[in-house]
C-alpha cells in the first residue's frame, strides 16, 4: 500500500481490488493491436496484527508484523502485494512493424497477500 | 512501503534493510532453544517511476506505476516486498516438551523488489 495514502481512517485489510487498464490511456494504442485493455487489478490494504490466514502471509511477514508492533518507528508493517499473477497474450507491432503475438507474464493480479 | 509511512518527502528507493530479530524480544525465548535470534531483514522504500532493473519489478508493477501516475488518488504505487526469502532451522520445544529441529521457510529476506 502506498505511502502517499494519508488516510486518517483505518484502511481495510489487504485484498485484491479490481482495475481495468486501457492501453489507450497508457498511450500504447499505436503499438498494441489487441486487446484494447485488460483487467490488471491491484493489491492494497493494511497488513495489521493479527495476520489472518486469508492474508497469505509468509513467516517473515508474521515476524515483521510483531517487530513493527514493538518498534513502529523503525520497522514498517509488511506490505500488501500480489501473491499470484497471470499472463496475458498481446498482439502488437514490433520495431520493424511486424505483427507479433506474445505472452506477457505477471500482468494480472489473481491474489494478494502480506509480504 | 507501508501505508503508515506518511512521507511528505521522497523516500529512498525500494531496497533490503538489515534487521536482527531477537526471539527474546518477541517473547519466544521459552519455546525456542536456538538460535537466540536471526538476521531477518526487511524491505522498504519507494517504487516510483521509472522502475529501474535493480527494483526487480514485475510487468504488473510497471503497469501499476504508470496507472498510479495517471490516477494517484485511486491506484497506489506498487509496494516494496521480498522477492527472495531463505529458510532458517530452529530448535524448539513442542507442546509435549519434546525438542524438535525444524526448518522454517520464508524467514529471511534476501532481496526486495517492486510488486
Amino acid at each position: 500500500s502506498a505511502s502517499d495514502y494519508n488516510s486518517s481512517e483505518l484502511k481495510t485489510a489487504c485484498r485484491k481490488h479490481e482495475l481495468y487498464v486501457s492501453f489507450q490511456d497508457l498511450g500504447w494504442q499505436d503499438w498494441i493491436i489487441a486487446p484494447k485493455g485488460y483487467a490488471a487489478n491491484y493489491c492494497d490494504g493494511e497488513c495489521s496484527f493479527p495476520l489472518n490466514a486469508h492474508m497469505n502471509a509468509t513467516n517473515h511477514a508474521i515476524v515483521q508484523t510483531l517487530v513493527h508492533l514493538m518498534n513502529p518507528e523503525y520497522v514498517p508493517k509488511p506490505c500488501c502485494a500480489p501473491t499470484k499473477l497471470n499472463a496475458i497474450s498481446v498482439l502488437y507491432f514490433d520495431d520493424n512493424s511486424n505483427v507479433i503475438l506474445k505472452k506477457y507474464r505477471n500482468m494480472v493480479v489473481r491474489a494478494c497477500g502480506c509480504h | 512501503s507501508a501505508s503508515d509511512y506518511n512521507s511528505s518527502e521522497l523516500k529512498t528507493a525500494c531496497r533490503k534493510h538489515e534487521l536482527y530479530v531477537s526471539f527474546q524480544d518477541l517473547g519466544w525465548q521459552d519455546w525456542i532453544i536456538a538460535p537466540k535470534g536471526y538476521a531477518a531483514n526487511y524491505c522498504d522504500g519507494e517504487c516510483s517511476f521509472p522502475l529501474n532493473a535493480h527494483m526487480n519489478a514485475t510487468n504488473h508493477a510497471i503497469v501499476q506505476t504508470l496507472v498510479h501516475l495517471m490516477n494517484p488518488e485511486y491506484v497506489p504505487k506498487p509496494c516494496c516486498a521480498p522477492t527472495k526469502l531463505n529458510a532458517i532451522s530452529v530448535l524448539y520445544f513442542d507442546d509435549n516438551s519434546n525438542v524438535i529441529l525444524k526448518k522454517y521457510r520464508n524467514m529471511v529476506v534476501r532481496a526486495c523488489g517492486c510488486h
Partner: antibody
C-alpha cells in the same frame, strides 16, 4: 552523553511564524527518528510530528492540529532538527520538546529541556 | 481529549502501592502496539520510565513496573516515595497511520 537542546522560542503574534531548532550531540543523529512534542501550560503532552532518518527518506508525519502549518526538517550535517511554525494560533502556546526515539522499542529515551512558545496579541 | 485515557490523579502514602491505568482502543493498544510510560517531575522534561510494556531503562528502580492486557496498560509503583510525586504519561501508536498517541497524564500525590 546524549544531549538535545532546543532554542528559538519566544513571543509571537497570532498569524506569525517562528522556527525552533534542536541541537543534538553525543550520538549518531543521522541514524535516529526524532519527534517534536509540546505541552501547553498546565496541560498534558501532545505529539506534534516526526521526521524519520535518511534510510527512510526523511519521511515526515504530523498531528492533525498542526498539519499544513508546521514543517519538520533536519540537517544531519549540523546534527540539528527544525520545526518551522507558520500561521500560529493562541492554542499553539506551549513548551516544545524534541525527543529521540531509541532503536529497539521506539520509546522516547532522550528529551530536550524544552523551549517556550507564546502566541499572543 | 486524549486518545489514551488515564485517571487525572492518584494518591498514596509512603510505602504504599499505587497503579495508574491507561485505556486505549482496538486501533492503538488493542492493535498490539507497545506502551511506554514517562515520568515528568515538576518543572522538568519527561523521562522514559517503562518501555515496551514492562522494561525499565537503566537507572529506573524496580519499584516501577508495567503491564498490558487487551486494550489497556497499567503502571504500578510499589514502596511509594516522596520523590515519586510527579505526572505520569502513557504513550502508544495509532495503527491508522502509526501516529504517536499520549494519555492525558496522571498526577501522583504522595500523602
Amino acid at each position: 552523553q546524549v544531549q538535545l537542546v532546543e532554542s528559538g522560542g519566544g513571543l509571537v503574534k497570532p498569524g506569525g511564524s517562528l522556527r525552533l531548532s534542536c541541537a543534538a550531540s553525543g550520538f549518531t543523529f543521522s541514524s535516529y527518528v526524532v519527534h517534536w512534542v509540546r505541552q501547553a501550560p498546565g496541560k498534558g503532552l501532545e505529539w506534534v510530528g516526526r521526521t524519520r532518518h535518511s534510510d527512510m527518506g526523511y519521511a515526515t508525519s504530523y498531528a492533525a492540529p498542526v498539519k499544513g502549518r508546521f514543517t519538520i526538517s533536519r540537517d544531519d550535517s549540523k546534527n540539528t532538527l527544525y520545526l518551522q511554525m507558520n500561521s500560529l494560533k493562541t492554542e499553539d502556546t506551549a513548551v516544545y520538546y524534541c525527543a529521540r526515539v531509541e532503536r529497539s522499542k521506539s520509546g522516547f529515551d532522550n528529551w530536550g529541556q524544552g523551549t517556550l512558545v507564546t502566541v499572543s496579541s | 481529549q486524549s486518545v489514551l485515557t488515564q485517571p487525572p490523579s492518584v494518591s498514596g502514602a509512603p510505602g504504599q502501592r499505587v497503579t495508574i491505568s491507561c485505556t486505549g482502543s482496538s486501533s492503538n493498544i488493542g492493535a498490539g502496539y507497545s506502551v511506554h510510560w514517562y515520568q515528568q517531575l515538576p518543572g522538568t522534561a519527561p523521562k522514559l520510565l517503562i518501555y515496551g510494556q514492562s522494561e525499565r531503562p537503566s537507572g529506573v528502580p524496580d519499584r516501577f513496573s508495567g503491564s498490558k492486557s487487551g486494550t489497556s496498560a497499567s503502571l504500578a509503583i510499589t514502596g511509594l516515595q516522596a520523590e515519586d510525586e510527579a505526572d505520569y504519561y502513557c504513550q502508544s501508536w495509532d495503527s491508522s497511520q502509526t501516529l504517536v498517541v499520549f494519555g492525558g497524564g496522571t498526577k501522583l500525590t504522595v500523602l
